[in-house]
């Protein structure tokens, strides 16, 4: 059947009124206020009608579940928890819902869910526990395949007292939860580093997206045991150079992809092994393409093109002769 | 599931020309490197040469035995591989087949077709 | 370019007891700390099937009666207990420089 829209009629200042009629049990095909629902493509779309909370009425069909560009703020514990439970429910998008809050155990009771975009909210405050669901050291395994996060980084002058991308790792890897995910993009997230441990307990991972961040070392991270990645995207990051270590994980990778356009690359003598490295890898995507930012003489120059006596640093002078 | 189903293959005369089809499907082309095999009756496998994926433009490398004569091509539209032979001489007589790269292509080949012989012969 | 030298050319087994094929290269097809050696096994009739990956990774799917070894340019095929199944031409391939190549086969054959 085509899509239809609910019976009732609200103006958009309606999702308070639409909760509370809500609270009565839902009838079997029932579509929430404000919402669009297709039985036959399994879908619900509930897009930019400013909700500020999740429709308790979802019909238990739903397999795929659209939430994109409300105003949700808070997804509290068991925000999906229903009774019967959403058993379905496989795909998730909350993204530009002005989410800044993802409280431990938000996605419970969800057991088909594969698919989960937070995208474009600015969550300030996600909750460790936000994807197991409790604070056991091991969780129960998530079916979770596929998490979405990118852009989720809040404003500078919202961010709690401390580390972004440690709030964002300990929700990845708290009770080993994750285990199955299989694709993980946090692009845009102004990460500087990512925390050594991160890849190591996320080891089905195919598709690891970090684009668009600000990393500037990949030294202390071990790619070793994604023996399954398949796509490594590092473009438009602050990387200078990419050292042995790194290249030789990378290179070892059975199914890897590796995407590392624009980024200000450092043509000195510690380029030189990466240089080496590219002109015979096939690993990475569209290589010929990557150039010099640094130092001023190198910039634009294609990192293909160089040869050895292209790569110099300059000497460091004794103390005696050096000059203020 | 990964398939690759090779056709195009005949009886041809030495110098004249032939094209080779390898259809692909279970898998996203556009991200693999393809490449051609080819063994001659009773004898061991020659590597013909790939084409790049998408993300490294597509490019192509031969061996030199081919150079010149045989281009390696591909409709990505179609998820078809095709291998245009020309000036072909008696000893370009084999079996050939067509062959996935493994996501990283340094690992060679993980899927082959089930081949089409190809026959130069006056 | 790198040839690969392989020996024994045929090798009657009987099945139970072990088997080992060598293949030895013209120069290092190791590449940043991997040898990019791969085992294929061509039944009668048949196209080739991958075995080994990376001169020791075994392919998905394939027993594990077959294992890989070796770096550098020494690289060795073990089949601990042979079965009739496993009868064919093995083919070890470089892809460390193109052109790859493969070596020219063993054949195994029950005794």
């Known amino acids: 059947s085509s899509p239809t829209s609910s019976a009732s009629s609200f103006s958009s200042s309606a999702p308070f009124l639409a909760s509370a009629v809500s609270a009565q049990p839902p009838l079997p095909d029932q579509c929430p206020a404000l919402c669009e629902c297709s039985e036959a493509a399994r879908t619900v779309k509930c897009v930019n009608r400013n909700l500020t909370e999740v429709p308790t009425d979802l019909p238990a069909y739903v397999r795929n579940l659209f939430l994109t560009g409300n105003q949700l703020a808070v997804l509290p514990a068991g925000a999906f928890a229903r009774r019967p439970p959403l058993a379905e429910l496989a795909a998730l998008n909350l993204s530009g819902s002005r989410l800044d809050e993802v409280r431990a155990g938000a996605f419970e009771h969800l057991p088909s869910l594969r698919q989960l975009d937070l995208s474009h909210n600015p969550l300030a405050d996600l909750s460790p526990f936000a994807f197991s669901g409790s604070n056991a050291s091991v969780s129960a395994p998530s079916p979770l395949v596929e998490l979405i996060l990118n852009h989720i980084v809040p404003p500078e002058d919202e961010r709690q007292n401390r580390s972004f991308e440690g709030m964002v790792v300990a929700a990845l890897l708290a009770g080993r939860a994750l285990q199955g995910l299989r694709r993980l993009e946090l692009a845009s997230n102004h990460f500087l580093y990512l925390p050594r441990d991160v890849l190591a307990q996320l080891p089905s991972l195919r598709h690891l997206d970090l684009s668009n961040n600000s990393l500037v070392s990949l030294t202390y991270v071990s790619f070793r045991n994604l023996t399954h990645l398949e796509s490594l995207h590092l473009e438009d990051n602050a990387l200078k150079v990419l050292h042995n270590g790194t290249l030789a994980e990378l290179q070892g990778l059975p199914h890897i992809r590796v995407f590392l356009d624009n980024n200000p690359w450092v043509c000195d003598c510690h380029m030189a092994d990466m240089v080496t490295w590219l002109k015979e890898t096939e690993v990475v995507q569209g290589k010929d393409r990557l150039t010099c930012a640094y130092p001023e003489k190198m910039r634009n120059r294609v990192l293909l093109e160089l040869n050895s006596a292209d790569l110099d640093c300059d000497p460091i002078l004794p103390p005696s002769l050096q000059t203020s | 599931e990964v398939q690759l189903v090779e056709s195009g293959g005949g009886l041809v005369q030495p110098g004249g020309s032939l094209r080779l089809s390898c259809a692909a499907s279970?898998?996203?082309?556009?991200?693999?490197?393809m490449s051609w095999v080819r063994q001659a009756p009773g004898k061991g496998l020659e590597w013909v040469g790939f084409i790049r994926n998408k993300g490294n433009g597509y490019t192509t490398e031969n061996s030199a035995s081919v150079k010149g004569r045989f281009t390696i091509s591909r409709d990505n539209s179609k998820s078809t591989l095709y291998l245009q032979m020309n000036s072909l001489r008696a000893e370009d007589t084999a079996v050939y087949y067509c062959a996935r790269y493994r996501g990283n292509p340094h690992y060679a080949m993980d899927y082959w077709g089930q081949g089409t012989l190809v026959t130069v012969s006056s | 370019d790198i040839v690969l030298t392989q020996s024994p050319l045929s090798l009657p087994v009987t099945p139970g007891e072990p088997a080992s094929i060598s293949c030895r290269a013209s120069?290092?097809?190791?590449?940043?700390?991997?040898?990019?050696l791969q085992w294929y096994l061509q039944k009668p009739g048949q196209s080739p099937q991958l075995l080994i990956y990376?001169?020791?990774n075994v392919e998905s799917g394939v027993p594990d009666r077959f294992s890989g070894s070796g770096s550098g340019t020494d690289f060795t095929l073990k089949i601990s207990r042979v079965e009739a199944e496993d009868i064919g031409v093995y083919f070890c391939?470089?892809?460390?420089?193109?052109?790859?190549?493969f070596g020219g086969g063993t054949k195994v054959e029950i005794k």
């Open positions: 120069e290092s097809v190791e590449f940043y700390g991997t040898s990019f």
């Open positions: 279970g898998f996203t082309f556009t991200d693999y490197y």
């Open positions: 990376g001169a020791s």
């Open positions: 391939q470089q892809s460390r420089k193109v052109p790859s190549t």
